[in-house]
């Protein structure tokens, strides 16, 4: 077990803070909840603290919760491939470019680390080149979320990982908006981290609303499990 992994044996409180600017529309979001890496479970609620969110909530899910991939459940035979936990408590920097097909792009930079007993994800997001009447600024996405696989590979040069995946957002007219994600994670501290073999995270997310909440918000329940690396031959013959 890595030193960082020991921090995730129970339920851990999570705080998310985002400052965003999309085509000049500035906004802030606060999120709170908890993660349980034993089950790969995340429960979070997000509030737009600046009024109405200028973009659809689903476009921010990867920035929020795919930001705290340290809560992914890594099966016993894959624990040596868990970069995310091994970087804790000092944490990691996570940078992404998200290209929305036939529309604009988000660039995000986040620092994910422990502050006391709380896992904090602080994010800056800049979005440019969006069409004012497109699927994103025109709020044409459905309020739901599909399952996805998130592909991870080691980046030995940077002592981190590279991550690629394609998100499918459902549009109200029945079509799909694709969002290509290019991600890079590098440790903040200078301690040893685990550099993985290629594998993927399987994610399932459910979006809902709090009937008692008057502010613009999103409630998120997510399960994430690592897969794609089989047991070694010695395991098969036990």
């Amino acid at each position: 077990m890595s030193k960082g992994e020991e921090l995730f044996t129970g339920v851990v409180p999570i705080l998310v803070e985002l400052d965003g600017d999309v085509n000049g529309h500035k906004f802030s979001v606060s999120g709170e909840g908890e993660g349980d890496a034993t089950y790969g479970k995340l429960t979070l609620k997000f509030i737009c603290t600046t009024g109405k969110l200028p973009v659809p909530w689903p476009t921010l899910v990867t920035t929020f919760s795919y930001g705290v991939q340290c809560f992914s459940r890594y099966p016993d035979h894959m624990k040596q491939h868990d970069f995310f936990k091994s970087a804790m408590p000092e944490g990691y920097v996570q940078e992404r470019t998200i290209f929305f097909k036939d529309d604009g792009n988000y660039k995000t930079r986040a620092e994910v680390k422990f502050e006391g007993d709380t896992l904090v994800n602080r994010i800056e997001l800049k979005g440019i080149d969006f069409k004012e009447d497109g699927n994103i600024l025109g709020h044409k996405l459905e309020y739901n979320y599909n399952s996805h696989n998130v592909y991870i590979m080691a980046d030995k040069q940077k002592n981190g990982i590279k991550v690629n995946f394609k998100i499918r957002h459902n549009i109200e007219d029945g079509s799909v908006q694709l969002a290509d994600h290019y991600q890079q994670n590098t440790p903040i501290g200078d301690g040893p981290v685990l550099l993985p073999d290629n594998h993927y995270l399987s994610t399932q997310s459910a979006l809902s609303k709090d009937p008692n909440e008057k502010r613009d918000h999103m409630v998120l329940l997510e399960f994430v499990t690592a897969a794609g690396i089989t047991h070694g031959m010695d395991e098969l013959y036990k």
């Epitope: 609620k45 509030i47 007993d117 709380t118």
Partner: nanobody, 128 residues
């Protein structure tokens, strides 16, 4: 040394509004869980409202639901209690409280009284 400095309060007619502020100083780690309590004349101190570290989760006593709103501005290290539709029975000394032990953990009982730090109290008087 952590300090809670309260402001606002005063006298108002029934049906009026007041806003209380509570600014925290002396600690820069994660924002604490914050709450407002009140003590009415001849009564025990009672819970009024609480807010989680990021301001996402809010809790209210039944007696103030729909009339009072708790909010926070973490950039200013300040928590507010907006009190609307005030009634004579809201007359009390109002205290803000901070709890660092809760940290970012929202899944707690906000109604407990064992907060780490307390403000000096602010008198609110509502006349009919």
């Amino acid at each position: 040394q952590v300090q809670l400095q309260q402001s606002g309060g005063g006298s108002v007619q029934a049906g009026g509004s007041l806003r209380l502020s509570c600014t925290i100083s002396g600690r820069t780690s994660i924002n604490p869980y914050m709450a407002w309590f009140r003590q009415r004349p001849g009564k025990e101190r009672e819970f009024v409202a609480a807010i989680s570290s990021g301001g996402v989760y809010t809790y209210y006593a039944d007696s103030v639901k729909g009339r009072f709103t708790i909010s926070r501005d973490n950039a200013k290290n300040t928590v507010y209690l907006q009190m609307n539709s005030l009634k004579p029975e809201d007359t009390a000394v109002y205290y803000c409280a901070a709890d660092f032990r809760r940290g970012g953990n929202w899944n707690v009982d906000p109604f407990r009284y064992d907060y780490d730090y307390w403000g000096q109290g602010t008198q609110v008087t509502v006349s009919s």
